[in-house]
Structure formats: structure tokens, C-alpha cells
Interface confidence: low
């Protein structure tokens, strides 16, 4: 008769590398009688008998882990019990080793010159790979600019046009490499202009040609513009050269001019542009041909978009270096002020200030602008805006809200023309029109004042300031 | 979380060279700019120059000649050397993280006081 | 080297009150990218410098809300609403658009 043994583990569980895929074996023999029960944990949890992902065999001591996977690592414990004495435990740890994985590789990316670009690269593997980058067919080097994150992306500060090339991402360990695919970091440049036209003194009848060069990535287009509008006559030669477009518009000179040569290209969705202006002066111009003080230009605006009838020629005010840009600005301003104003007010004044800041225009030697009618910003100042008008007009007075950035250029009512004297001379507020049939208190359409003589512009207009405190209601 | 610790004597000679060490705890050095940055007593902070974990330096121009930065990434370390002192670099001298997501010095060590005399 | 200017170099404030600090480059710290590249620091007394804004108006973590960074270009201001004794200590501002990195000259912020 065998006396009863205590388990005893004769062979202790040691430390297991697996491949992923790859079968992994833990041997725990054990001496005891009679014959132990023998059970297995991972990570103090109990593996089931019927699981299919093991296999336990040779009476328990031998378990197989059929087909490793990166979540099988832990510590793997046998435990043996007979009823004779305590139970015994050995314990072993594996270590599921993976040949590197790229999980997120890098992309095509398109970045603008001077903008942060990441090329992503994660990757997997055991031992954690080291990720290196190669562009074109030499290794990349890190410097102030361009690192390799800790996740194994690639970052690159301030992007330059020589950055642009093939890159491709390599991850590295004892076990293997594995490479991306080769992606392409195409770098655009904002358009920009080399060589701005040149302003010209001529006779009149002569021929002049204005040149621009502009480059950019991708390469930009140039278009020119005559007195804000498309350039209607003479001929445009170009040619492109290593990213650089050389623009000749050659005209024959019968008035004078301001021609901007505008450069654009397309990052995505967006466009950068980058315009020059030249003015083409005749000697000897008569003085009544100079007195005009703009032109005439559609719309391209945000701002009055839809309070402006559809392509409808602007008159633009040249004595602003930039009129297209600064009238946007001065219509912005007004309409971050209009956003306290009482419902009714609101879309009168801004049909008003639109009108008023971009006047229609009639084009010709000298383009004129056609103010609004009398009729129209009396109907503004009176009725829909009354209350606000008269706050306003109070404020000024006692010189509150001089402040430039919340000035309101409304016009000067009584200065403007009447639209009975002369209908062709000004302008109507459509918007007034639609609404006065649903108001019966409509001011009476002649001049609460003496008829005068009508300018032809405002001579002026009177600002009045409304500021971020004082609400317009 | 990360923690940086400046070591180095606290008393150099004249026309010897001062050499500070920084070591990162809690976290990598990897994928920072490290800095160092200096304070003369009662004065206001100068910027000494910064090394990559790849290696790579920027000096301030003013120091450049006499400025050396080095990396360890297997000790977690960084140091500075400043050769030929005068009394005018005794300052307390700090090294710092740059966070270039940040664009900003969010991780500073305490400071070593420096003292130049013979 | 960009030179950044601050004034005013000490402020007495009464706590709850609130205080103003005032930086100036001299030149744009503003990237075509819409960022500013302008950071704020305060050393309290002892204490290395901690990051309070960073590219001119985002809070660093753990900072109070109290803390405020505004300004574009050239000009930025750090404003904090009310005061507290724990504030005290000197304010930096610094360019990190180019290197080298430049601080301002500091100013004290003392209780009264």
C-alpha cells in the first residue's frame, strides 16, 4: 500500500516567449499520490476545462495555448491539490512577442508652406518597435524642425517647399521590420507676386504692356482687372516656368486706369490670392475726366451679398488704398452694431447702410456712383428706425460714443436726392418697397423740408456711434 | 507625472567650465525640446538654448561660442556645459520642458544656484 | 533678438481688485497659422516660473479661471479678475515665435 504524498511540482513553471499565431506550452509536473487535481489560472482566473483556445493534457500538467493572440500575456499559475496536506501553486509568466505591425500608417498629405504637418505611423509589436522615417531613399534626419513622436508619427514645424517628397515609415525589432507604404508630402505655397506691374504715364492712343509674375504651389493663375471689373480689351500673354507665371497684358490706352494683376491658387477648398495694382495716367487729362474718385466693380463681398441686387456694378472709393477691402470692413463694423437693434430696424438699416457704402454705379469715362433716394433714408430714420435713430442722434449730440470702431455711416438724410425730382439720380431700397405695403404709417414720399438743390452726392455723411453698452432697442 | 531635477557643483572658478545635468523622472525624453534657462539674482530669466532628443541644438546667439548640450535618452538625462565663466553667469540656472503642442516651458525643474568666484 | 517690453514693472493691488499687466513686442508675434506666439509665467517668491497662458490666450492646466491672456501682434495683456494672495510673485511674458526665446523684464505683483 502507497502512503499518501503531499504534490510536490517537480518542474516550476518558467517564463514563456510566443509568437502571435504561434502554439505556447506550460509544463507543470507534479509528484504526489494519490493522483492531484490540477487546475490553471491566468492572471488568478480560472481557465476552463471545456475552452477550445487551450488544450490541458497529461493529466492537467501540460497546458497549450492553441494559437497565441497579443492579449494572451500574463502570469499562468498551476495548481495542484490531493487532499494531502496544502494545495501547491507554481506560476510562470508569457510573454507574447509580436513582429512589428505598422496599425495606423501614413497618408497623402497636402500642407501649406509654413503650416505643422503630422504623418502618422502607429504600430504594434513586442518588443515595442523603434520607429524610424525615410524620405526619398535616405534615412530622415530629426533636427529643430522635424521630430519623431513617441507614438511614431512625424512631425514637421514650419513647413518648408523642401520638405515635399516621398516618406515612408519603418518599424523596427528583434523580431522583424515592417515598412509603410511610400506617401507623398506635397507642400503649397500661397501665391505670391514676384514682379507687381508698373504704373505708366502715356499718351493717349498708345500702347502699353503691364507685366506681373506671381508663384505659388500649385501654380497660381493671374487674372487682370480694369477699374474693378474684368479687363475688357487688349490681349494677355503668358508663360510658366519652375512655378512661376509670367502675366504681359498689353492695351491700348484711350482713358485712364487702375489695372490690378490678381494671382490665386487653390489649397483645397480655399483660395489664396495676392494682387499688385498700376494706374495708366494720359498725359495731359482733362481735369473734368480726373475728377472721378473710383469705380465701378461688382460685388464680391460677404457682408451685403444679399441685400445687394445680383451683380449689380458697386461704385468703389479709390481714395482708400484698398476700396474693396475697406468698404467691407466699414459694412462689418455696421453690421456687428445692427445686431442690438429691434427686429423691425434691423434689415431696414442694413438694406440702408449697403446701399449707402455701396452705391450703384454707373460706369463710362468717369464712373459715378448713384446715391440713395431722399424718400428712402427718410423712411429708415422715421419710421422703421425712429426710436433708435432718435437715441442715437441724442448720443452724438452730447459727443458720447466718439470711439472710430463702432461709427455707423449712416447718410445725412436731408442731403440726399429726391427720387421726385429726378428718379434716374438715386437710388431705391427694393426691401422698403416690399415692406411699406404692410405698413400704414408709412412716411408721406415728398421731403419734410424745402426742396434745395440736390447734389449729386452725399456731401457728406454723419456718423453717429453706437457702443457695445448702449443697445439700440 | 514628469519631473525634472538639475544637479551640478554649486561653485565654479573663473575661466572654468560650468557643467549642469538635468535628469527627466516620471516620463520619457523623447519627442521634447529640452531647455535651459538662467536667472541672475534679482534679474530677469535669459534663455540659454535647448537640445532635441535626437540631438540636435539652438544656442542663444549671445552664448553660442561658449555653450554645449548634450543628451543621454538611456539615463533620462540632459546637461549643459558653459565654458570660460566670469562672475557674471553665477545665476540660479533651471532646465525646462518645451511643449511644442503648447509652444510653451509647462515643465520647470526647482533651480541650482551657480556662484563664479575664485 | 525680439525685445519684449512690460509695464508696468511693480503693481500694488488690493485683493479681490482686479490687475492688468501689459506686454509689448517689438515686433509681430503673430503667425500666418492665426497663432500668437506669446507665452505668460508667473514666479512666485522661492518658486521656479510656472506656465500660466500660452500662445497668447489658451490657460495653461490647473490654472485658475481667473487668469486671462489677450492681445494680437505686437500688444497683449494678462488680466486677472480678482486677486488673491496666492498671486503674488513676478509675472513674465516671452516670445516663442523665434530663437532665441525672450522674456519680458518682469513685473512684481504686491498686496497692499
Known amino acids: 500500500e502507497k502512503l499518501p504524498k503531499a504534490p510536490v511540482i517537480t518542474t516550476p513553471l518558467e517564463t514563456v516567449d510566443a509568437l502571435v499565431e504561434e502554439v505556447a506550452t506550460f509544463m507543470c509536473a507534479v509528484e504526489s499520490y494519490p493522483q492531484p487535481e490540477i487546475s490553471w489560472t491566468r492572471n488568478k482566473i480560472l481557465i476552463k476545462l471545456f475552452d477550445t483556445r487551450y488544450s490541458i493534457r497529461e493529466n492537467g500538467q501540460l497546458l497549450t495555448i492553441l494559437s497565441v493572440e497579443d492579449s494572451d500575456d500574463g502570469i499562468y499559475c498551476c495548481i495542484a491539490n490531493n487532499g494531502v496536506g496544502g494545495a501547491v501553486e507554481s506560476c510562470g509568466a508569457l510573454q507574447v512577442k509580436m513582429k512589428p505591425k505598422i496599425t495606423r500608417p501614413p497618408i497623402n498629405v497636402k500642407i501649406i508652406e509654413g503650416l505643422k504637418a503630422v504623418l502618422p505611423c502607429t504600430t504594434m509589436g513586442n518588443p515595442k518597435p523603434s520607429v524610424s522615417w525615410i524620405k526619398g531613399d535616405n534615412a530622415l534626419r530629426e533636427n529643430s524642425r522635424i521630430a519623431v513622436l513617441e507614438s511614431g508619427s512625424l512631425r514637421i514645424h514650419n513647413v518648408q517647399k523642401e520638405d515635399a517628397g516621398q516618406y515612408r515609415c519603418v518599424a523596427k525589432n528583434s523580431l522583424g521590420t515592417a515598412y509603410s507604404k511610400l506617401v507623398k508630402l506635397e507642400v503649397e505655397v500661397f501665391a505670391r507676386i514676384l514682379r507687381a506691374p508698373e504704373s505708366h504715364n502715356v499718351t493717349f492712343g498708345s500702347f502699353v504692356t503691364l507685366r506681373c509674375t506671381a508663384i505659388g504651389i500649385p501654380v497660381p493663375t493671374i487674372s487682370w482687372i480694369e477699374n474693378g471689373n474684368a479687363v475688357s480689351s487688349g490681349s494677355i500673354q503668358e508663360s510658366v516656368k519652375d512655378r512661376v507665371i509670367d502675366s504681359r497684358l498689353q492695351l491700348f490706352i484711350t482713358k485712364p486706369g487702375l489695372y490690378t494683376c490678381i494671382a490665386t491658387n487653390k489649397h483645397g477648398e480655399k483660395f489664396s490670392t495676392a494682387k499688385a495694382a498700376a494706374t495708366v495716367s494720359i498725359a495731359e487729362w482733362s481735369k473734368s475726366q480726373k475728377d472721378s474718385q473710383g469705380y465701378c466693380a461688382q460685388y464680391r463681398g460677404e457682408v451685403c451679398d444679399a441685400v445687394l441686387a445680383k451683380d449689380a456694378l458697386v461704385f468703389f472709393n479709390t481714395s482708400y488704398r484698398d476700396p474693396e477691402d475697406a468698404q467691407e470692413l466699414l459694412i462689418h463694423t455696421a453690421w456687428n452694431e445692427l445686431k442690438a437693434v429691434s427686429p423691425l430696424c434691423r434689415p431696414a438699416a442694413e438694406a440702408l447702410l449697403c446701399n449707402h457704402l455701396f452705391q450703384e454705379c454707373s460706369p463710362g469715362v468717369v464712373p459715378t456712383p448713384m446715391p440713395i433716394c431722399r424718400e428712402y433714408c427718410l423712411a429708415v430714420k422715421e419710421l422703421f428706425c425712429a426710436k433708435e435713430w432718435q437715441a442715437m442722434e441724442g448720443k452724438a449730440h452730447r459727443g458720447l460714443y466718439r470711439s472710430g470702431m463702432h461709427l455707423l455711416p449712416v447718410p445725412e438724410c436731408s442731403k440726399l436726392p429726391s427720387m421726385h425730382r429726378d428718379p434716374t439720380a438715386c437710388t431705391r431700397l427694393p426691401y422698403l418697397d416690399y415692406k411699406k405695403e404692410n405698413i400704414t404709417t408709412f412716411p408721406s414720399i415728398t421731403s419734410s423740408r424745402p426742396s434745395a438743390d440736390i447734389p449729386n452726392l452725399p456731401a457728406s455723411t454723419s456718423s453717429f456711434a453706437v457702443s457695445p453698452a448702449y443697445s439700440m432697442t | 507625472q514628469v519631473q525634472l531635477q538639475e544637479s551640478g557643483p554649486g561653485l565654479v572658478k573663473p575661466s572654468e567650465t560650468l557643467s549642469l545635468t538635468c535628469t527627466v523622472s516620471g516620463g520619457s525624453i523623447s519627442s521634447y525640446y529640452w531647455t535651459w534657462i538662467r536667472q541672475p539674482a534679482g534679474k530677469g530669466l535669459e534663455w540659454i538654448g535647448r537640445?532635441?532628443?535626437?540631438?540636435?541644438?539652438d544656442y542663444n546667439p549671445s552664448l553660442k561660442s561658449r555653450v554645449t548640450m548634450s543628451v543621454d535618452t538611456s539615463k533620462n538625462q540632459f546637461s549643459l556645459k558653459l565654458s570660460s565663466v566670469t562672475a557674471a553667469d553665477t545665476a540660479v540656472y533651471y532646465c525646462?520642458?518645451?511643449?511644442?503642442?503648447?509652444?510653451?516651458?509647462?515643465?520647470w525643474g526647482q533651480g541650482t544656484m551657480v556662484t563664479v568666484s575664485s | 533678438d525680439i525685445v519684449m517690453t512690460q509695464s508696468p514693472l511693480s503693481l500694488p493691488v488690493t485683493p479681490g481688485e482686479p490687475a492688468s499687466i501689459s506686454c509689448r513686442s517689438s515686433?509681430?508675434?503673430?503667425?500666418?497659422?492665426?497663432?500668437?506666439?506669446l507665452d505668460w509665467y508667473l514666479q512666485k517668491p522661492g518658486q521656479s516660473p510656472q506656465l500660466l497662458i500660452y500662445?497668447?490666450?489658451n490657460r495653461a492646466s490647473g490654472v485658475p479661471d481667473r487668469f486671462s491672456g489677450s492681445g494680437s501682434g505686437t500688444d497683449f495683456t494678462l488680466k486677472i479678475s480678482r486677486v488673491e494672495a496666492e498671486d503674488v510673485g513676478i509675472y513674465y511674458c516671452m516670445q516663442a515665435l523665434q530663437i532665441p526665446h525672450t522674456f519680458g523684464q518682469g513685473t512684481k505683483l504686491e498686496i497692499k
Open positions: 525646462a520642458r518645451y511643449n511644442w503642442n503648447d509652444d510653451a516651458f509647462d515643465i
Open positions: 515686433q509681430s508675434l503673430l503667425h500666418r497659422n492665426g497663432y500668437n506666439y
Open positions: 500662445l497668447g490666450s
Open positions: 537640445i532635441y532628443t535626437s540631438g540636435s541644438t
